[in-house]
Interface confidence: low
């Protein structure tokens, strides 16, 4: 068991909120059995930890929100992996169980004597985790103990089912909406034949299922559908790329309902196989506008169209985050490890000094260098505020006219908190309204991004459109520069006049060969030729029959 996962970030308070963030990457295939997590993550990890700590500071200093009540937190590392997250959730539950048994905080020892140390306060709710598969596993545990969970990026459609996931809510929409947005993009550019890839796990599987269902209804054919684990080895990605290549040049578009690291795996395989420029990737919000997906593989990613949850940068977070330094930031137990990883240097004399780096970190280093805010930052903050507003509404109804935690609110009842959370309605960090429908979901608003070469060796994501509650808007000129550049992804070209489509046995309906009708036949429908009746002949446009004018022969007429 890796000791890095035992690390927990604490912030004291009257009420404690739990949080699961992917502070480290998921274990690689060979390390899964020992649950050894990967490298530290900035956007998905450290930034989210700091967002939690700082947002709680802001809430605690807001006199209108939970007056006389201090919110604290316990942050644990999910490593974007179910087994790790479950292990950490059990720790949350254990704290709650010990606390509920010992309301006064005195813990009874095994031998019956009492211990003098105070037990931890119970966790009233959990923020996160990021991944749908992991969120499902965590929810299965939390709901047994009536602990509400608010997710900031778990978008799987399955999580809308309240009979299965009663204590789950999210400040993001269900993936059914982005699957629709992806289909709308495919339709817009008349791509009728596409390959499909998804990340193994709930997010990718349910998202791709929705994409395929909707595609079928729109007459879009899937050349082939493939799945792959995010942490699959290079050979698996190479094999997948070769399979995708077998559908070229027809299926040029690859719809990828994928986590970011799956997309990165594909891009790396494209580099190894020399396949850059062969495909246009249409990516879900797992890719969005993340630079950690494309870094070093920009040429392979160029042209990619991605879906991004609408969430502007949060300025006040950057103001706070960019000032952080390892000498002064002691409350984030992962910060020193991150600093050394980020700047590839050694923090000499620090408790977490990493000797693998030869260079010593100098004092001029700053997080402002190459800073990119986590694209889901707004959602993380909105999830924390949702919990605070839920608790605030609960306090108002249970403790009228009382500032602080009244007896009626102690210990906090998860069922009542869930009720209160579901009714929450407030203005989010970006000025949008945060509310939850009967399934605990939030409305769907997406930005459409395009990864482009902006200049020599300079690449960036450009906002080229939006999808808002069913309406797609796209700046086609920005994506294609001219109409003739629009990539074609079709199996068969339309048939010419007088020809019908013949679909080979076992082929999808988008693939056909064109066969001309016989001399006396007309095109009845796109799949059928019909013979004209005796005395009639096909029209010039071969869409029907005209009667042959009767010509009476007279004795003196020359031979025809």
């Amino acid at each position: 068991q890796s000791s890095e996962r035992r690390v927990v970030a604490h912030m004291p308070g009257d009420i404690i909120i739990g949080a699961l963030f992917s502070v480290h990457h998921q274990p690689t295939v060979d390390k899964v059995h020992e649950r050894k997590c990967g490298a530290v993550r900035e956007q998905y990890g450290i930034q989210r930890v700091e967002a939690m700590l700082h947002t709680l500071e802001r809430i605690n200093s807001d006199p209108t929100l939970l007056p006389n009540i201090t919110l604290g937190c316990e942050i644990r590392d999910s490593c974007w992996h179910s087994a790790v997250a479950l292990e950490q959730s059990i720790e949350f539950i254990r704290d709650s169980l010990i606390s509920s048994e010992e309301e006064e905080g005195l813990v009874r020892c095994v031998d019956g004597s009492s211990s003098s140390f105070r037990s931890k306060k119970p966790i009233v709710g959990v923020i996160g985790p990021g991944s749908s598969s992991v969120a499902i596993q965590v929810q299965n545990l939390l709901q047994l103990f009536n602990i509400p969970q608010i997710a900031y990026s778990a978008t799987s459609m399955d999580l809308s089912d309240k009979t299965l996931f009663k204590y789950f809510m999210r400040v993001v929409p269900s993936d059914a909406q982005q699957a629709r947005a992806m289909v709308d993009i495919v339709k817009r550019y008349n791509w009728t034949y596409v390959s499909a890839v998804h990340t193994e796990g709930n997010y990718g599987e349910s998202g791709m299922e929705a994409f395929k269902d909707m595609s079928a209804k729109e007459g879009i054919c899937i050349a082939h559908s493939y799945k792959i684990y995010s942490n699959a080895g290079e050979q698996s990605f190479d094999k997948l790329l070769k399979k995708l290549t077998s559908h070229l040049p027809k299926a040029r578009v690859v719809a990828c309902f994928c986590e970011g690291m799956t997309v990165r795996g594909l891009l790396m395989a494209m580099r190894r196989l020399g396949l850059a420029g062969e495909f246009l990737l249409l990516g879900s919000d797992g890719w969005a506008d993340r630079y950690d997906v494309t870094d070093g593989y920009q040429r392979e990613a160029v042209g990619g169209i991605t879906i991004k949850l609408q969430s502007p940068d949060v300025k006040w977070f950057d103001d706070y985050y960019l000032k952080l330094r390892p000498e002064t930031n002691h409350r984030n137990p992962w910060f020193q490890e991150f600093w050394q990883h980020r700047f590839q240097c050694r923090l000499e004399g620090f408790p977490q000094e990493n000797s693998k780096y030869n260079k010593t970190c100098n004092s001029s280093l700053t997080l402002k260098t190459h800073h990119v805010q986590d694209s889901k930052m707004g959602f993380v903050i909105n999830a924390i505020y949702s919990m605070a507003y839920g608790l605030h509404n609960m306090q108002m109804s249970l403790c009228p006219g009382y500032a602080g935690l009244c007896d009626a609110m102690k210990p906090i009842d998860g069922r009542k908190l869930l009720e209160s959370l579901m009714k929450t309605n407030f203005t989010g960090v970006s000025g949008d309204t945060i509310l939850f429908d009967e399934n605990g979901d939030s409305p769907g608003r997406y930005e459409i991004m395009n990864f482009k070469e902006m200049g020599k060796d300079y690449f960036d994501y450009i906002n080229v459109g939006s999808w808002d509650n069913g309406e797609l808007k796209m700046d086609d000129d920005e994506v294609w520069s001219k109409k003739s550049n629009i990539i074609r992804s079709v199996c068969s070209e339309p048939c010419e006049k007088g020809q019908i489509k013949v679909i080979r046995k076992g082929e999808v309906s988008c693939c056909w060969t064109c066969t001309p009708c016989k001399e006396n036949e007309y095109v009845f429908d796109e799949y059928t030729c019909k013979a004209c009746q005796l005395g009639s002949w096909p029209t010039d446009d071969l869409t029907g029959c005209d009667l042959i004018p009767v010509q009476y022969l007279r004795w003196g007429d020359p031979e025809p």
Epitope: D238, K239, T245, L248, R272, G274, E278
Partner: antibody, heavy 120, light 109 residues
Framework: QQQLEESGGGLVKPGGTLTLTCKGS?????????MCWVRQAPGKGLEWIAC???????TYYANWAKGRFTISKTSSTTVTLQMTSLTAADTATYFC?????????????WGPGTLVTVSS | DIVMTQTPASVEAAVGGTVTIKCQAS??????LAWYQQKPGQPPKLLIY???NLASGVPSRFKGSGSGTEFTLTISDLECADAATYYC???????????FGGGTEVVVK
């Protein structure tokens, strides 16, 4: 210093068989890139023959080479090209080359070449 | 198979001048093209990959451009050492095959 060296060339009779070997020094063929064979007839241009992908051993051939030529990886530093049913038209200098793609990224390392002469 | 047609077969230019070599693919190969320089008795040397990217250690006087079916190699500020035969190599991903152009001999006066 990364280097490639071909061996096994020489005089062979028409209809004969020959196996060329490409050995790398400072290059581990287990890395994820391609080892390829290219030939050049005297006074003529370059002609692509085949590549093998080290990631999974998958092979790729020019249409004209399929059936007569076989590329394979025999060790972590050796790739061979087996040639059968040789004719005078196969007389050429045979180069082994390394690339990070089958073609799109070009071949950045080449051996000096080995001459194969098919004559009776 | 894909066919690469290279023009001209031979070109002469003075030191300090500029030479342009064209390469045409029989089908669209996107940016899947490399350029090589070969001197007598030596193996080819990679100059440009993916149509326009300069290989390591190659001077910026060599410039590759184009995509789809039409590609160009431009050598400016010609030096005596640039006298060689230049080959383009196209890669067709759909069939995973390569083809070289016929070569262009560059003579520097």
């Amino acid at each position: 210093q990364q280097q490639l060296e071909e061996s096994g060339g020489g005089l062979v009779k028409p209809g004969g068989t020959l196996t060329l070997t490409c050995k790398g020094s400072g290059i581990d063929f287990n890395d994820y890139y391609y080892m390829c064979w290219v030939r050049q007839a005297p006074g003529k241009g370059l002609e692509w023959i085949a590549c093998i992908y080290n990631g999974d051993g998958e092979t790729y051939y020019a249409n004209w080479a399929k059936g007569r030529f076989t590329i394979s990886k025999t060790s972590s530093t050796t790739v061979t090209l087996q040639m059968t049913s040789l004719t005078a038209a196969d007389t050429a200098t045979y180069f082994c080359a390394r690339g990070s793609g089958v073609g799109s990224y070009g071949y950045n390392f080449w051996g000096p070449g080995t001459l194969v002469t098919v004559s009776s | 198979d894909i066919v690469m047609t290279q023009t001209p077969a031979s070109v002469e230019a003075a030191v300090g001048g500029t030479v342009t070599i064209k390469c045409q693919a029989s089908e669209s190969i996107y940016s899947n093209l490399a350029w090589y320089q070969q001197k007598p008795g030596q193996p080819p040397k990679l100059l440009i990959y993916r149509a326009s990217n300069l290989a390591s250690g190659v001077p910026s006087r060599f410039k590759g451009s184009g995509s789809g079916t039409e590609f160009t190699l431009t050598i400016s500020d010609l030096e005596c050492a640039d006298a060689a035969t230049y080959y383009c190599q196209g890669y067709y991903a759909s069939t995973v095959t390569n083809a070289f152009g016929g070569g262009t001999e560059v003579v520097v006066k």
